[in-house]
Interface confidence: low
């Protein structure tokens, strides 16, 4: 058993046949010594008396809010949550496996630049009685600070018969060094509590591996005289790291016909302009990627040829 | 070239060669995302590699103030990786394919380090750790880790030279 936060405790249980469970001793936070009784949740049934209560925690029925009273007055509470190890594996029931980039990916994170700011998100089908708390650090043995905000519900989607809820959190490395080569990964730890079930999820990454620039901005076309060619120009996204002479991007320019089956023409360039042939009813799209490290491409920015 | 007394390197040449190094490092080990190397207990293998750290003056401001600290750090790393790529880790079994980019990568590391330091002038270089994996699979894993680490190192070096070429070239 360990303390998650004040008056909230996590009991780690081997979810096993005939498992004896964990013996837990609760102590009433009071100077009083006698006349103390204990109850669980909303029940008025007295579970025991005295300053301490010893219980055997085996199932969810044994978890919940234990309260000690004296003469009708509440003295203190202890909330017991269960963390299940089922058939040798810690349970991961609360979050959905996103399966990208590999199986057992529950947390996904992205950064728009090298400033040390990143966003993580996760999915669940649970709509109520759900809380998350997020901690992060750079490295684990001698951790350096990363500050995370509160996790918030960022999207709701309908998937078949199910509703899916996306939660996200923003974090910022306290003393980020955008130009340095990372040697210690960022660690992100999410505590999830659904009703009386506790689970924890972790992710470890370098910022450089989760970089995904915003799409290029101000995408414009300039027809070239007496030609089917156009000059496409764009700018670095506002959110990208500066100076651009140091934090450089490379770009992919694509001409795509109306039909998805039509051949796509692609040009790669380090410049912020390119000359392409604009076909009727086609559109021109540009996306960006770090020039020197192959992290994710941005989403496309697009304009119609007409 | 970075010569004694600290005059400027050939920023544009360094820029071109470092960008080529980035391309080669990724073509030598493109499937980075398919293996989470941090799960493979790499403390004893790639912790000794020289990283370009915050105080090494490789940020735009540090380069403007005095690029020598940063260039020395980059040179150190280039020599380190050049030695690793020429070691038993890459020359031993399982043999690299004849068209593997590792050979080109090795030569380009040497080329860039020589651009930074001509004969007769010696910056202090870091000792290469004695890594001699006993099993072919260990060697394969070590190659992946070294190339992964090299990708991060040359990305920073390429940024340095690109910025230098754009803002510090005479």
């Amino acid at each position: 058993i360990w303390e998650l936060k004040k008056d909230v405790y996590v009991v780690e249980l081997d979810w096993y046949p005939d498992a004896p469970g964990e013996m837990v001793v609760l102590t009433c936070d009071t100077p009083e010594e006698d006349g103390i009784t204990w109850t669980l949740d909303q029940s008025s049934e007295v579970l025991g008396s005295g300053k301490t209560l010893t219980i055997q925690v085996k199932e969810f029925g044994d978890a919940g809010q234990y309260t000690c009273h004296k003469g009708g007055e509440v003295l203190s509470h202890s909330l017991l949550l269960l963390h299940k190890k089922e058939d040798g594996i810690w349970s991961t029931d609360i979050l959905k496996d996103q399966k990208e980039p590999k199986n057992k990916t529950f947390l996904r994170c992205e950064a728009k630049n090298y400033s040390g700011r990143f966003t993580c998100w996760w999915l669940t089908t649970i709509s109520t009685d759900l809380t998350f708390s997020v901690k992060s650090s750079r490295g684990s043995s001698d951790p350096q600070g990363v500050t995370c905000g509160a996790a918030t519900l960022s999207a709701e989607r309908v998937r078949g018969d199910n509703k899916e809820y996306e939660y996200s959190v923003e974090c910022q490395e306290d003393s980020a060094c955008p130009a340095a080569e990372e040697s210690l990964p960022i660690e992100v730890m999410v505590d999830a509590v659904h009703k009386l079930k506790y689970e924890n999820y972790t992710s470890s990454f370098f910022i450089r591996d989760i970089i995904k620039p915003d799409p290029p901005k101000n995408l414009q076309l300039k027809p070239l005289k007496n030609s089917r060619q156009v000059e496409v120009s764009w700018e670095y996204p506002d959110t990208w790291s500066t100076p651009h002479s140091y934090f450089s991007l490379t770009f992919c320019v694509q001409v795509q016909g109306k039909s998805k089956r039509e051949k796509k023409d692609r040009v790669f360039t380090d410049k912020t302009s390119a000359t392409v042939i604009c076909r009727k009813n086609a559109s021109i799209s540009v996306r960006a990627q770090d020039r020197y490290y192959s992290s994710s491409w941005s989403e496309w920015a697009s304009v119609p040829c007409s | 070239r970075a010569v004694p007394g600290g005059s400027s390197p050939a920023w544009t040449q360094c820029q071109q060669l470092s960008q080529k190094l980035c391309t080669l490092a990724w073509s030598a080990h493109p499937l980075v995302g398919h293996m989470d190397l941090r799960e493979e207990g790499d403390e004893e293998t790639t912790n000794d590699v020289p990283h370009i750290q915050c105080g090494d003056g490789c940020d735009p401001q540090g380069l403007r103030d005095n690029s020598q600290f940063c260039l020395q750090r980059i040179h150190q790393g280039l020599i380190f990786y050049e030695k690793l790529l020429g070691s038993d880790i890459f020359t031993g079994e399982p043999s690299l394919l004849p068209d593997s980019p590792v050979g080109q990568l090795h030569a380009s590391l040497l080329g860039l380090s020589q651009l930074l330091q001509p004969e007769g002038h010696h910056w202090e270089t870091q000792q290469i750790p004695s890594l001699s994996p006993s099993q072919p699979w260990q060697r394969l894993l070590l190659r992946f880790k070294i190339l992964r680490s090299l990708q991060a190192f040359v990305a920073v070096a390429a940024r340095v030279f690109a910025h230098g070429a754009a803002t510090l070239s005479p």
Epitope: D14, W15, Y16, P17, D18, A19, E59, F60, G61, K85, E86, D87, G88, I89, S91, T92, D93, I94, T125 | -
Partner: antibody
């Protein structure tokens, strides 16, 4: 008292599907994972997969490559195992077993024959 | 997948005598938490398997104390101190350290 009661024997043609049920009683159905295990005549036991009845999350033995689907009906406290594209080597007794494998159903014989 | 190799295939025993069944795992079943994730089952003719031992050495409820489990992370043993006529059947070991869970091929215990 804990009980797992399975559906009756089935005879199926190759290529068909079979759906075996397992009704749980005597405990909180959603609190415990449900495993499915099969045993071909004279052979050892083979684990097929597991479901968490509370959330519907499943883990399958890759050997069955998409042929097996495990589901639950919480309101009926029943777990189901469906096996598709049946072949003769799928002839076996199919068991459900509660988390930890302390409690087993009585088994359901599925015979695949043309 | 973890392979469980069980020996012997057949075990004829005289009532009152001890018996020992061995199970070798291709990968350690000992977790960082100090527990070894191995089960032993007995399947009597025409019945479902019944759990005898879990976590390598803990007897399931109602299992007589003549049954005991021991071993290391990879070499596991089930011992019966004095075999009785009701102990006949096929004994299986099973790992639940990682998915997919796998069983040994079985050991048939018969009375001499």
């Amino acid at each position: 008292e804990f009980q797992l009661v399975q559906s009756g024997a089935e005879v199926k043609k190759p290529g068909a599907s079979v759906k075996v049920s397992c009704k749980a009683s005597g405990y909180s159905f959603t609190d415990h994972n449900m495993n499915w295990v099969r045993q071909a005549p004279g052979q050892s036991l083979e684990w097929m997969g597991v479901i968490n009845p509370n959330y519907g999350t499943t883990t399958y033995n890759q050997k069955f490559k998409g042929r097996v689907t495990i589901t639950v009906d919480q309101s009926a406290s029943t777990a189901y195992m469906e096996l598709s594209s049946l072949r003769s080597e799928d002839t076996a007794v199919y068991y459900c077993a509660r988390r930890g494998f302390a409690y087993w159903g009585q088994g359901t014989l599925v015979t695949v024959s043309s | 997948d973890i392979v469980m190799t069980q020996t012997p295939l057949s075990l004829p025993v005289t009532p009152g005598e001890p018996a020992s069944i061995s199970c070798r795992s291709s990968k350690s079943l000992l977790y960082k938490d100090g527990k070894t994730y191995l089960n032993w089952f007995l399947q009597k003719p025409g019945q479902s398997p019944q759990l005898l031992i879990y976590l390598m050495q803990t007897r399931a409820s109602g299992v007589p104390d003549r049954f005991s489990g021991s071993g290391s992370g990879t070499d596991l043993t089930l011992k019966i101190s004095r075999v009785e006529a009701e102990d006949v059947g096929v004994y299986y070991c099973q790992q639940i350290a990682e998915y997919p869970f796998t069983f040994g091929s079985g050991t048939k215990l018969e009375i001499k």
